[in-house]
Every structure is written in C-alpha cells, then in structure tokens.
Amino acid sequence: FERTRSLQDPCSNCPAGTFCDNNRNQICSPCPPNSFSSAGGQRTCDICRQCKGVFRTRKECSSTSNAECDCTPGFHCLGAGCSMCEQDCKQGQELTKKGCKDCCFGTFNDQKRGICRPWTNCSLDGKSVLVNGTKERDVVCGPSPADLSPGASSVTPPAPAREPGHSPQ
C-alpha cells in the first residue's frame, strides 16, 4: 500500500522538515527559514511561532518542530501550548478581573496562579484537623477523631466565610 501510494503521490516521500514544491515539479524542498513541517508529505511549511513581548522562547523553532514559548518572570502560562501569559500573584492571593486580591478567610492559594480554594473540611472525610489552614496553605487532615488516643484534642477550623460580599470573585 505504501509503495502504491508513493507511485501515485510523489509528495508522500517528502520527509518532515521539507515540503512538496508544486512549483518545482513536486520535488521535496527544505522548509524556508522560520518555518517547519512536523510530518511528512506536507505541501507547505508552517510559519514558526514567535515568542515576543511577555512570551519568551523555551524551545527554538527547527525545520521539523515549532517554537515553544513560556512566560517572562512575574507571569505564568495559560491555555494549551501557553497561548496566553497571565500575571502572577503572591501565594495567599488570587488574580481577579480587578487585580490580585487576598484570599478570604477559610480559603487558600498555595501557588502564584489560580484561585483561592476553600480549606478541606476534614470531618467530611472522617478525619480530624492536624494543622490549621492559612491563606497560603490548606488544612492538614489527620486520623479520624476515633483513632485519637483518649485526652488528645484536635483543632477544628471555623467554617469558611460564605457572605456574598466576601466570596472570591
């Protein structure tokens, strides 16, 4: 089948890094500078992605693979293939449409990206709180209260604030 296809379509012989040049009797021509073809049999080469502005180059473009970008310090990637760079916040904060905001009581964010999340409610998983939560850290759950030796106490954090005015937006 492969041999038959090759006889019918000379372009199928063109390897990655080349394209089938219709202007030159369908011979395999190397991709021009700043372009690539990642698969064989291509009739054109794709333009390399350029990592400009807040994007920086993580991997240079080659004749067979596109460039890969990441973000400059103070920003992080969003989306497949780092399609966007988004501003970092501090741990204990989240980025809202109005900028970085501290996590409300009862929520945490242990990263520079993403949202403030509610502390884990250990009791719902049949466990007790070993370490209280903070704006930067989730609570640490331990063994179930029944597993604790007599006289041992567990710390239970107050329920997360749920007033509409305090919920992270």
């Epitope: 497949a80 949202i115 999340r117 509610p118 719902l124 919920s167």
Partner: antibody, heavy 120, light 106 residues
C-alpha cells in the same frame, strides 16, 4: 496522549455504596485537581466535588456532603469517587474531569463516563 | 447559591450564526467556560475564560461575557455543531453549571 479511563458500569441496590475509579495517564497526575461531575438521564451536568491529587485535600458540593468521598492513589495515578446511601435518583453517568489552567476552574479533559444504575 | 440560566433550546439554519446565552448575577465579574456535549459522549471544553479557545476548537466558536450575560457564539453553523451546550463558572466554593441548551441545526 492524555487520557482518563473510568471503571465499568455498575448496578446497585438502594442503600448500597458505589466506588468509581478514574485512571489518569499522559500527564503529571499530581499537578492537576480532579473533579467529579454527574449527569442523570436526560438531565444537565451536576458538580460533585474535587480532590487535590498532591495533598489529598477535597471540596464537596453541599448537596453531596456526608454521602460522597473522593480519594486518590498517587502510585496508581487514580482518583476514586465513592457515593453511599444510594437512592434511585442517583442513577446517572458519573464523569471524572481534570481541571485545566484557566483562572476559574475549567475542566479540560473528561473520562468516558461510568453509568451507575440504582434499582431494587 | 449562584444560579446560571440558559435557554432550553436554540435553532439555527446551517451557515447562519447561533448565539447561546448564559445569565447570572454580575456574571461579567466571573470567568465563564463553555462545554459541548453530543449524545452518548462526554462533554468537551470549547471556550474557557470567557473567550479563549482550546487547541483543536474551530475559530467559528467564540465567547463574550459582560454585565449579567455571557454568550457563546457559533458562526457558520454546521450540522456537526448540533449538541447540548453548558456554561460553567466557579462561585465561592463550588463549580456551577447552567441547565444546558440544545442546539438544533435545521
């Protein structure tokens, strides 16, 4: 490539429990929160909760608190959802879904779904 | 708890533009995600963070979000776009889905 493969269909009696598994491959399991979402026949999507595969921390929808437990086994790159005290209205397709990178919890990859039928 | 309202159904002729709305109190301050679900299949993310498209999703799919309404717009609608569409937001401590909209291609 990235894949979430769920366990097979289950038939349960009212009052019983069911435990559905979701095996992840093709990405760093501990790097992304895992959510569970269910869909009753002919109905919409209903969020149940999440697990942080790194820490084991959880968050559950109020409706399911006390009946659902979401856990994970990092060595097996697998998340589990256990629902207890089943009733007929729990008959649904249960999906695991990986949280993506957007600012406000998008679910960018989904398992194929597991049908749980509750019938006496 | 936060609620999202979608029209149960929207009909559109092939080649035309479909607009599916998602209403919620001050939804413009939140990030909205949209999913497409075809019969017997798992949902697929088609728009995230109001208006961004995951790789592999056609440019015909776009989104907007302001005030009390988010909108998923599908231009040059094709028969293969016929599906249920769900909006979704994060609110305080839970993930919230809209009721879903069935898109029918006439």
């Amino acid at each position: 490539q990235m894949q979430l493969v769920q366990s097979g269909a289950e038939v349960k009696k009212p009052g019983a429990s069911v435990k559905v598994s979701c095996k992840a491959s093709g990405y760093s399991f501990t790097g992304y929160y895992m959510h569970w979402v269910r869909q009753a026949p002919g109905q919409g999507l209903e969020w149940m909760g999440w697990v942080n595969p790194k820490s084991g921390g959880t968050n559950y929808a109020q409706k399911f608190q006390g009946r659902v437990t979401i856990t994970r086994d990092t060595s097996a790159s697998t998340a589990y959802m256990e629902l207890s005290s089943l009733r007929s209205e729990d008959t649904a397709v249960y999906y695991c879904a990986r949280e993506g990178w957007a600012r406000r919890i998008d679910l960018d990859e989904w398992g194929q779904g597991t049908l749980v039928t509750v019938s006496s | 708890s936060y609620e999202l309202t979608q029209p149960p159904s929207v009909s559109v002729a092939p080649g035309k533009t479909a607009r599916i709305t998602c209403g919620g109190n001050n939804i413009g301050s939140k990030s909205v995600h949209w999913y497409q679900q075809k019969p017997g299949q798992a949902p697929v993310l088609v728009i995230y963070y109001d208006s961004d498209r995951p790789s592999g999703i056609p440019e015909r799919f776009s989104g907007s979000n302001s005030g009390n309404t988010a909108t998923l717009t599908i231009s040059r609608v094709e028969a293969g776009d016929e599906a249920d569409y769900y909006c979704q937001v994060w609110d305080s401590s839970s993930v919230v889905f809209g009721g879903g909209t069935q898109l029918t291609v006439l």
